[in-house]
């Protein structure tokens, strides 16, 4: 609506502002043991690990933007359990990263973001 | 714990890890309208913006990631009334940015992320 | 093992400031906030602060805030609490702990005794 | 400052007997994620403290089975089930939900 009112490097900016926000995979950082759901007597060092996972804005307030594609990150983790029975353990600890993202209506029945072992 | 156990490439990887998840300034996107508690009548285009946000992990459970210092960025953004009485008009929104985060016990009563006019 | 070792005992006169040191060894030490407690003679236990290793920021107990300043050197995995003006009081048992992620203080240093006495 | 108030502050106990230690603290330690950062400490004579129990009721390594704590609120117990020679000394409840991280006063436990 607005090309004839304002200049096109106006509009650019805008527009490229616009399409840094649009639903996407971004670098975001998760706390392992709460993914998990372990209990309290289990944790992880480090806690927390980067993966990507599905964030920004949609078009219409209705929409979410959701993961529709993920693959499973092998991240390399000492677990350790509380009481200390043996050396803390050097385990693969298998995180969802979202590859692929869309602006969509309702959250699917099951997310794909839970790590799995 | 571990340096006896384990080769320090491994060792070096883990901890590379656990830095990029530390506390500090990330590139996030936000709704402008909501942070700036407009009323539903009044909407942008772009409705989001990018910004740096306080984000990421902190060495105690206990402890939240918060902004210590803050500048504001102003984003031109189309702000539009409806019903469309006039033109949307092309406006500086000041946006809170963040630029120092710490590790904090308790959320300090008036924090710095509101985006001002 | 994890392992806290601290400097010696240290007799200082009132006014004087000291600088007690704790050297850690067998863990990630820019992974773990380092606590400062200390222990008057006889007394319970005192909190006076922490510092994070990784950023270098501190939080202090207010009751100490202008006397105290926690350092540390990432590159000797040290870390360090230096009490200024001292009075007769501060007379105590310095001790360093390392704090894990869930809060609690799960290894402690065996103490720095600092006596302040004319 | 949070007020941490241990009871009793010292105690004769019988060899092979239970005991049992209380804090309550002056607010909640309930903090904003659901968790409550409430520990138990030991000290043995001329020894620094020793991490005994964390987050209310976790055993921390390498710490026995007698040794157990409870609570939730204000309200906490730390409880020995069969007390041995080796746990005479003094044990602080301590919190590090808030600043600054405060201690009770300390439960000096002696054998009768």
């Known amino acids: 609506f607005a090309a004839t009112f304002y200049d096109i490097e106006t509009l650019k900016v805008i527009d490229e502002e616009w399409q840094r926000t649009q639903c996407s995979p971004r670098e975001t950082c998760v706390e392992v043991a709460s993914e998990l759901g372990k209990s309290t007597n289990t944790f992880f060092k480090p806690p927390c690990v980067n993966v990507f996972r599905c964030g920004g804005c949609c078009n219409e307030e209705s929409l979410i933007c959701m993961n529709t594609s993920t693959s499973y990150i092998s991240k390399q983790l000492f677990e350790i359990s509380v009481p200390l029975t043996s050396v803390p353990e050097l385990v693969p600890v298998k995180v969802a990263n979202h590859t692929g993202c869309k602006c969509l209506p309702t959250a699917p029945r099951h997310p794909y973001s839970i790590i799995r072992r | 714990f571990a340096a006896t156990f384990y080769d320090i490439e491994t060792l070096k990887v883990i901890d590379e890890e656990w830095q990029r998840t530390q506390c500090s300034p990330r590139e996030t996107c936000v709704e402008v309208a909501s942070e700036l508690g407009k009323s539903t009548n009044t909407f942008f285009k772009p409705p989001c913006v990018n910004v740096f946000r306080c984000g990421g992990c902190c060495n105690e459970e206990s402890l939240i990631c918060m902004n210590t210092s803050t500048s504001y960025i102003s984003k031109q953004l189309f702000e539009i009334s409806v019903p469309l009485t006039s033109v949307p008009e092309l406006v500086p929104v000041k946006v809170a940015n963040h630029t120092g985060c710490k590790c904090l016990p308790t959320a300090p009563r008036h924090p710095y992320s509101i985006i001002r006019r | 093992q994890v392992q806290l070792v601290q400097s010696g005992a240290k007799v200082k006169q009132p006014g004087a400031s000291v600088k007690a040191s704790c050297k850690a060894s067998g863990y990630t030490f820019t992974g773990y906030n380092m606590y400062w407690v200390r222990q008057a003679p006889g007394q319970g236990l005192e909190w006076m602060g922490y510092?994070?290793?990784?950023?270098?920021?501190?939080t202090y107990n207010q009751k100490f805030k202008g006397r105290v300043t926690m350092t540390t050197d990432t590159s000797t995995s040290t870390a360090y609490m230096e009490l200024r003006s001292l009075r007769s009081d501060d007379t105590a048992v310095y001790y360093c702990a390392r704090t894990s992620y869930y809060g609690g203080m799960d290894y402690w240093g065996r103490g720095t005794l600092v006596t302040v006495a004319s | 400052d949070i007020v941490m108030t241990q009871t009793p502050l010292s105690g004769p106990v019988t060899l092979g007997q239970p005991a049992s230690i209380s804090c309550r603290s002056s607010q909640s330690l309930v903090h904003s994620n659901g968790n409550t950062y409430l520990h138990w400490l030991q000290q043995r004579p001329g020894q620094p403290p020793r991490l005994l129990i964390y987050k209310v009721s976790n055993r921390f390594s390498g710490v026995p089975d007698r040794f157990s704590g409870s609570g939730a609120g204000t309200d906490f117990t730390l409880k020995i089930s069969r007390v041995e020679a080796e746990d005479v000394g003094v044990y602080y409840c301590?919190?590090?939900?808030?600043?600054?991280?405060?201690f009770g006063r300390g439960t000096k436990l002696e054998i009768k």
């Open positions: 301590s919190q590090s939900t808030h600043v600054p991280r405060t």
């Open positions: 510092i994070d290793p990784y950023s270098g920021d501190t």
